[in-house]
């Protein structure tokens, strides 16, 4: 039995999936960020986790995804106010007991060190120093990202 | 380039609603957030609302109740409903595009609304 | 929410720098880095001119420039021509996804 929070990054995940080729991204979109093969778009406004998703998901992104702890740090470095939060792709699956990333890849226990508690309608934000788990429902700002890529690509759920 | 173009009726009584539409051409509505401005003849800017292309909205806490705001992708549309209106909502009304949720990079040229019996 | 305080009148002649403020409070202007500003000329539309504070978009002369300490943000006309001649708004990021506007200022160059 998914959670809603599950169901909802699946149904999007899918639904971006059925376009099966886009043109690659050259440059990244004005107002994004370029950080090296990525394209990324912090929000001014807030939403809970949910929302965040569908967002991204309209701008044919996607919430970020961070791939190792180099990655979190770099991303950090671009978060200019100390206080502020926020979300990132990940959240808690209550089904397999463990922090999910939207792309369906499960957590390296490694990358991340979340404070906070991994439980149901629990998601993943960043600051400029940390990861907390937040509950879902908070409302803080969040991260889109889009894959830079030269050539024509098929659009995966991950991408 | 991106433009954008109000429309709607320019005179509408006292304690009924005003209705506007921003058509924007030379770009999707779709990957950005979009939001209505009024300003009242010879004052400043006051922001009314913005509309999320994933159809959730906000709204100035003052005039929150008198407030819906939709949007047409298909006709890369998107609208103003003010309801209860007085003298005091004659103004100017602009569409602005919203991109991050804090400033407004393109607007309408503007369409003044009365409102008069 | 309150309008942010600008003073409704500014000048300069040509060639002279004029700056313009905008005060706030910590819940807007001093919370945020997300202020902007705006030239309007007389029955025109705003246009867009500075946001997040110091950004400047393309096409807009570099002679006008943004910047903030605590609840104020300014904007900076240098070498003032006189096409500047307009009214200008600030607005900021206000919480809970408000916006909120000056009450803008009228440049007059002299």
């Known amino acids: 039995q998914k959670s809603s929070i599950e169901k909802c990054s699946v149904d999007i995940q899918q639904s971006r999936n059925k376009t099966t080729e886009r043109p690659g991204l050259l440059n990244c979109p004005i107002y994004w960020q370029q950080l090296r093969e990525k394209c990324l778009l912090f929000s001014h406004t807030v939403n809970p986790w949910n929302n965040s998703l569908a967002d991204c998901s309209t701008k044919e992104s996607s919430l970020l995804l961070i791939r190792d702890k180099d990655e979190l740090i770099h991303t950090q470095n671009l978060i200019r106010d100390k206080a502020i939060l926020f979300w990132i792709g990940l959240n808690f699956s209550l089904s397999e007991k463990n922090w999910k990333w939207i792309n369906g890849s499960f957590l390296n226990s490694n990358d991340l060190e979340i404070r906070g508690d991994a439980k149901e309608n629990s998601c993943i934000s960043i600051s400029q120093t940390s990861v907390y788990s937040e509950y879902c429902s908070t409302e803080i700002r969040w991260i889109c990202q889009k894959e830079l890529t030269p050539v024509r690509n098929k659009v995966y759920p991950d991408s | 380039q991106v433009q954008l173009q109000e429309s709607g009726p320019g005179l509408v009584k006292p304690s009924e609603t005003l209705s506007l539409t921003c058509t924007v051409s030379?770009?999707?509505?779709?990957?950005?957030?979009w939001s209505w401005i009024r300003q009242p003849a010879g004052k400043g800017l006051e922001w009314i609302g913005r509309?999320?292309?994933?159809?959730?909205?906000n709204k100035n806490p003052s005039l929150k109740s008198r407030i819906t705001m939709s949007e047409d992708r298909s006709k890369n549309q998107f609208s103003l409903k003010l309801s209860s209106v007085t003298a005091a909502d004659t103004a100017v009304y602009y569409c602005?595009?919203?991109?991050?949720?804090?400033?407004?990079?393109?607007w309408g040229q503007g369409t003044l609304v009365i409102v008069s019996s | 929410q309150s309008a942010l305080t600008q003073p409704p009148s500014a000048s300069g002649s040509p060639g002279q720098s004029v700056t313009i403020s905008c005060t706030g409070t910590?819940?807007?202007?001093?919370?945020?880095?997300?202020v902007s500003w705006y030239q309007q000329h007389p029955g025109k539309a705003p246009k867009f001119m500075i946001y997040?504070?110091?950004e400047r978009p393309s096409g807009v002369p570099d002679r006008f420039s943004g910047s903030k300490s605590g609840n104020t943000a300014s904007l900076t006309v240098s070498g003032l021509q006189a096409e500047d001649e307009a009214d200008y708004y600030c607005?900021?990021?206000?919480?809970?996804?408000?916006?909120?506007f000056g009450g803008g200022t009228k440049l007059t160059v002299l």
């Open positions: 602005a595009r919203d991109p991050l949720g804090s400033f407004f990079d393109y």
């Open positions: 030379g770009g999707s509505i779709s990957s950005y957030y």
């Open positions: 509309i999320y292309t994933s159809g959730s909205t």
């Open positions: 910590s819940s807007d202007v001093g919370g945020y880095n997300y």
């Open positions: 997040e504070v110091s």
């Open positions: 607005s900021s990021y206000a919480g809970s996804n408000n916006v909120v």
